[in-house]
Amino acid sequence: SSSPTSSASSFSSSAPFLASAVSAQPPLPDQCPALCECSEAARTVKCVNRNLTEVPTDLPAYVRNLFLTGNQLAVLPAGAFARRPPLAELAALNLSGSRLDEVRAGAFEHLPSLRQLDLSHNPLADLSPFAFSGSNASVSAPSPLVELILNHIVPPEDERQNRSFEGMVVAALLAGRALQGLRRLELASNHFLYLPRDVLAQLPSLRHLDLSNNSLVSLTYVSFRNLTHLESLHLEDNALKVLHNGTLAELQGLPHIRVFLDNNPWVCDCHMADMVTWLKETEVVQGKDRLTCAYPEKMRNRVLLELNSADLDCDPILPPSLQTS
């Protein structure tokens, strides 16, 4: 992800007696929470791989970049970062790999400058629809978030409690239309089988969308038409068989787009003809010369760009009266 790393060379370590500070007390100017490292010069606090079970209450007010990775947080309650005075400068928050399984409504409230949030590598079985919007109003106050990194947040299959994981994530992205300003969204490695059709239309500012390493079979009902600012679309390592005319036309119509399609099991039959024609003409697909057929068996490993219409046939479907069992 693109969360910032600190350029600071000197970090002050915490004093044990500071661990008991409470959020209602204004932090001391040079205070650093227990088990964290702080650099006021770099406006950075790192509490990394320390098995923290809660967000420290005594974060310094100057913090702009906060790393809380590799901990044991489990739950982010409402107002997990609400402080008096507020953490008004906090712009980048990395919570990856902290064993979070529950993020409650309003978890990121009172962070007026928060632009980058990374929740990757947490098994988010319970992501509140209002985790990012903070309220259940039909239209919420706009979130300042510009970059949201949600790679590998899918819990184990037996822990999804019969809910649609895709639906849960999308509900959080769309609630209250709070994320209208979002420019980067990463949803890689989440076992997504489908993309709910309304999600992209409601994120009109997107520049970068990463859906790589999922299980997407089709984009037939997904519309990219409104994403006029989209610059990169990562669809590598999915289960895509073919892209149909409607999708091809929409992608071609996006002025700045680069599309990444490597490592999909393309089915090279008669339905692939339009896509092959498009690939030969388009400049939007990066590494298009690497795309190869996976099926049918006779076409395996053939390069899509080298196919012609004679190669792309469909076995005739026998009428029912002629079919054998």
């Epitope: 079970t53 064993r99 079985a125 184990p156």
Partner: nanobody
Framework: EVQLVESGGGEVQPGGSLRLSCAAS????????MAWFRQAPGKEREFVAA????????RYAESVKGRFTISRDNAINTVYLQMNSLKSEDTAVYYC???????????????WGQGTLVTVKP
């Protein structure tokens, strides 16, 4: 209501080890956290360790950090407490509990087992 059944208690010498088990009658989906508490004679029940069913996050009381390890096996709805370097002050009845919160308070947990006695003496 979930039935929680502890086992594995017994008598052990200082410095020895024991492994406690807590079997849940069914997976308590409403209870996201499993914990161990203990109660020594004449003292209040105190938090020992907790684990989340899903993410596997763990937390420990300061008095047992580095000596005790909590773990869970989701496939058989069982939580374990591996206790090493036991001390006489670890003598207590150990209770398994299930709850929603990620907390250390008695009131964070709604379902309780009957307890298993651990005695540490020379």
């Amino acid at each position: 209501e979930v039935q929680l059944v502890e086992s594995g208690g017994g008598e052990v010498q200082p410095g020895g080890s024991l492994r406690l088990s807590c079997a849940a009658s069914r997976r308590p989906f409403s209870s996201k956290t499993m914990a161990w508490f203990r109660q020594a004679p004449g003292k209040e029940r105190e938090f020992v360790a907790a684990v989340r069913w899903i993410g596997g996050a763990t937390r420990y009381a300061e008095s047992v950090k580095g000596r005790f390890t909590i773990s869970r096996d989701n496939a058989i709805n069982t939580v374990y407490l591996q206790m090493n370097s036991l001390k006489s002050e670890d003598t207590a009845v150990y209770y398994c509990a299930a709850g929603q919160a990620w907390g250390t308070k008695f009131t964070d947990y709604s379902d309780w087992g009957q307890g298993t006695l651990v005695t540490v003496k020379p």
